[in-house]
Interface confidence: medium
């Protein structure tokens, strides 16, 4: 074992630690004698060689087949297998700043960086990704088309947990009071489709209207909700009698 090569512990002969100390704290060398800087993620560990200290809290020393390409040791032509420090908790965690970190070790690193800048430390709020209210990634676009046409509106939303997406038709009576009608209702010419994605925690929904009738004209709202909140976006469907009535002005955002 590495301790076989350890002579008597003479603290006076230990190399000095950096004057500013170690960002991940101190630990003892392989012989348990001299204080050394604790190793961080991807840094060499274990073994009896001088300077091969132990990993920081929350990390473990794991043999790696890869060489530390472009990192310390590569220049010295290190061994083909190398023990490096890796994070014990390799699952995402939610920080007190609302940011999700791939591991607790990366959150700790970010916290130390923040503190070094004179900012507040970041603590772990929960395991898993941080929850966030829905937001509209791609809102539906206004549509102009003729009676009898096939048209669709689409809406892409994101949130954690993954939001629930619904469609409403917004109606206003003569006095301007707004009412919403949950779609599809009993409309035979209207279909709603929802699928997960394209990205994680995203949902995409479509309203398909076929054939389009005058009664379908109006404002359609895409509404997303989860435990953290809600978001919505709306688009208008305008039904005309003939194609030449459709404005084709640039930048109007209307589509056929």
């Amino acid at each position: 074992s590495s301790s076989d090569a350890c002579g008597p512990c003479v603290p006076a002969s230990c190399p000095a630690l950096p004057r500013l100390g170690c960002p991940l704290g101190e630990t003892r060398d392989a012989c348990g004698c001299c204080p050394v800087c604790a190793r961080g993620e991807g840094e060499p560990c274990g073994g009896g060689a001088a300077g091969r200290g132990h990993c920081a809290p929350g990390m473990e020393c794991v043999k790696s087949r890869k060489r530390r390409k472009g990192k310390a040791g590569a220049a010295a032509g290190g061994p083909a297998t190398l023990a490096v420090c890796v994070c014990k908790s390799r699952y995402p965690v939610c920080g007190s700043n609302g940011i999700t970190y791939p591991s607790g070790c990366q959150l700790r690193a970010a916290s130390l960086r923040a503190e070094s800048r004179g900012e507040k430390a970041i603590t772990q709020v929960s395991k898993g990704t941080c929850e966030q209210g829905p937001s509209i990634v791609t809102p539906p676009k206004d549509i102009w088309n003729v009676t009898g046409a096939k048209v669709f509106l689409s809406c892409e939303v994101i949130g954690i947990p993954t939001p629930v997406l619904i469609w409403n038709k917004v109606k206003r009576d003569h006095s301007g009071v707004q009412r919403t009608e949950l779609l599809p209702g009993d409309r035979e010419n209207l279909a709603i489709q929802t699928r997960g994605g394209p990205e994680k925690h995203e949902v995409t929904g479509w309203v398909l209207v076929s054939p389009l009738s005058k009664e379908d004209a109006g404002e359609y709202e895409c509404h997303a909700s989860n435990s953290q909140g809600q978001a919505s976006a709306a688009a208008k469907i305008t039904v005309v009698d003939a194609l030449h009535e459709i404005p084709l002005k640039k930048g109007e955002g209307a589509q056929l």
């Epitope: 050394v36 961080g40 840094e43 990192k71």
Partner: nanobody, 127 residues
Framework: VQLQESGGGLVQTGGSLRLSCAAS??????????MGWFRHAPGKEREFLTA????????YYTDSVKGRSTISRDNAKNTVYLQLNNLKPEDTAVYYC???????????????????WGQGTQVTVSS
């Protein structure tokens, strides 16, 4: 091994500068080195300002620049940067970058701890 600073110049009080330090040299693995920035004002000792570990994961700032400077590095470009904001006349000095071989996350602050030094870049802050 060569360290070359750039980005210095004359700037008004309250202004900003971004200093760069490009490393080059045969068999010099930039990502194996902790980096630091120092400055030297006339009639004063060389003053340590900030340090960054080999990986760029950890940074250290002294009180004189904390809150108004950011050290960063790009190991692919063999370059370390120092962003200086809200500059004051007392920031006038020659700014130096320095490199120290380090396989671990550690900070180095003394002139004697660093192995390689740049030639420096002049920063002048006018009131």
């Amino acid at each position: 091994v060569q360290l070359q600073e750039s980005g210095g110049g004359l700037v008004q009080t309250g202004g900003s500068l971004r200093l760069s330090c490009a490393a080059s040299g045969r068999s010099f693995t930039f990502s194996s080195y902790a980096m630091g920035w120092f400055r030297h004002a006339p009639g004063k000792e060389r003053e340590f300002l900030t340090a960054i570990t080999w990986s760029g994961d950890y940074t250290y700032y002294t009180d004189s620049v904390k809150g108004r400077s950011t050290i960063s590095r790009d190991n692919a470009k063999n370059t370390v940067y120092l962003q200086l904001n809200n500059l004051k006349p007392e920031d006038t000095a020659v700014y130096y970058c320095a490199a120290k071989f380090s396989q671990v996350s550690a900070f180095f602050a003394t002139v004697s701890e660093y192995e390689y030094w740049g030639q420096g870049t002049q920063v002048t802050v006018s009131s």
